[in-house]
């Protein structure tokens, strides 16, 4: 028996369902009574889902997993993982034993898009050229950790005086706060880009200072 899985990681959005694909080639005359199928976490060997003794033994993992019972006899041993969480991320091993055994691991990468950044200034009034201001770019509920880039109105990267912090909430999603300290020119635009490295998703925020008033 030869087990095959996708070599590329499966990318799943938080709160959506994901399918971890696994297949084997049944011999002629194969019946499900011969099958021992186990999905487990690769590192800890924690049981996730199993099929043995001719029947689906169910989920051993948060009751959020399912096989495709009608397709098993054709060699489809894929696992459905429902309502994906950040903590589901990692490697899963598909182990198939019939006459012989084989196994392969598939990687699950969890992702969540970042919100459109909100921009705040401090101080936010009586601004004059030459003043030092703090611009904060905040984006929420993303995963994994973001990459943050700042640019001026001409598209020139601003790398000095930038402090970025990322805090995970109780669901494991990150809130990003990036602070840029700049000396104001006569006018200018400051842009913040929050990038999700897995989804290749960019969220943009900007603030334009043209004397008074400010535009966001």
């Amino acid at each position: 028996v030869e087990v095959q899985v996708s070599e590329d990681p499966v990318v799943a959005l938080v709160d959506t369902d994901a399918t971890l694909r696994c297949s084997f080639s049944p011999e002629p005359g194969f019946s499900l009574a011969q099958l021992n199928l186990i999905w487990q976490l690769t590192d800890t060997k924690q049981l996730v889902h199993s099929f043995t003794e001719g029947r689906d033994q169910g989920s051993a993992y948060s009751n959020r997993t399912a096989l495709f019972p009608d397709l098993l006899v054709q060699g489809n041993a894929s696992l459905r993982l429902q309502r994906v969480r950040v903590t589901d991320e990692g490697s899963y091993t598909c182990f198939v034993s019939i006459q012989d055994f084989d196994s392969a691991a598939v990687s699950l990468q969890v992702a969540a898009p970042y919100s459109k950044p909100s921009m705040t200034l401090e101080p936010n009034k009586d601004l004059r050229p030459g003043n030092m201001v703090t611009i904060t770019c905040s984006s929420y509920q993303g995963y994994p950790e973001a990459e943050v880039f700042w640019k001026d109105g001409q598209g020139v990267p601003l790398t000095g005086n930038v402090t970025t912090s990322q805090m995970a909430n109780e669901r494991g999603l990150f809130d990003v706060h990036s602070v840029l300290r700049v000396v104001l020119g006569a006018n200018g635009t400051y842009s913040c880009l929050v990038r999700n490295p897995v989804l290749q998703q960019d969220a943009h925020g900007s603030v334009t200072i043209t004397g008074q008033p400010l535009t966001f």
């Epitope: 030869e2 021992n36 487990q40 060997k45 043995t52 182990f95 019939i98 055994f101």
Partner: antibody, heavy 119, light 108 residues
């Protein structure tokens, strides 16, 4: 008749290496997974390596991982166990076994070959 | 890895008696369990597979039972040739499939 004949056991110093062989006959060797099981002087049994029929998948317990390597030559109907960085606790009788259809246990065992690790 | 706790470690009984050896798994192994007998100086021999099935040539006085995490091997009316050591082994999940510590059955 299924036959499994082990060879290669010897007295070896700690840190040394040894390669065990198992010659199989009486069945279609390339259709079966195979395992090495050892029995320590205190009579405990431990499965130290297992390999599937085409040699593509192997498993080891933590006690030997990185030190032992199981392999097979289906053309020669032979199973191997390469052991390196040997320790005194590897002293045991090493048995070659055939993996049966799942849940059917290890129905065929060789006579064993003795490995002694001692200074 | 799954742990197999076998008891008792040793047993001294007379011919004709009935004995029961038990094996407890650290998690559900879904009847993926084998029992072996080993005589002094010999290789282990398969007695029971899939918890309850007798291997070829095994006398009917041997029987296996159990499910989930608890399994047992029963020998009715012990014969002199039954003395030796007995081991359980699970076959659940990915290898290595671990053995119990063994039970030495001696003549009283």
């Amino acid at each position: 008749e299924v036959q499994l004949v082990e060879s290669g056991g010897d007295l070896v110093q700690p840190g040394g290496s040894l390669k065990l062989s198992c010659a199989a006959s009486g069945f279609t060797f390339s259709s079966y997974g195979m395992s090495w099981v050892r029995q320590t002087p205190d009579k405990r049994l431990e499965l130290v390596a297992t390999i599937n029929s085409n040699g593509g998948t192997t498993y080891y317990p933590d006690s030997v991982k990185g030190r032992f390597t199981i392999s097979r030559d289906n053309a020669k109907h032979t199973l191997y166990l390469q052991m390196s960085s040997l320790k005194s606790e590897d002293t045991a009788m090493y048995y070659c076994t055939r993996n049966e259809e799942f849940r059917r246990g290890l129905a065929y065992w060789g006579q064993g070959t003795l490995v002694t690790v001692s200074a | 890895d799954i742990q197999m706790i076998q008891s008792p470690a040793s047993l001294s009984v007379s011919v004709g008696e009935t004995v029961t050896i038990t094996c407890r798994a650290s998690e559900n192994i879904y009847s993926n369990l084998a029992w072996y007998q080993q005589k002094q100086g010999k290789s282990p021999q398969l007695l029971v597979y899939a918890a309850t099935n007798l291997a070829d040539g095994v006398p009917s006085r041997f029987s296996g039972s159990g499910s989930g995490t608890q399994y047992s091997l029963k020998i009715n009316s012990l014969q002199s040739e039954d003395f030796g050591s007995y081991y359980c082994q699970h076959f659940w999940g990915t290898p290595p499939w671990t053995f119990g510590g063994g039970t030495k059955l001696e003549i009283k």
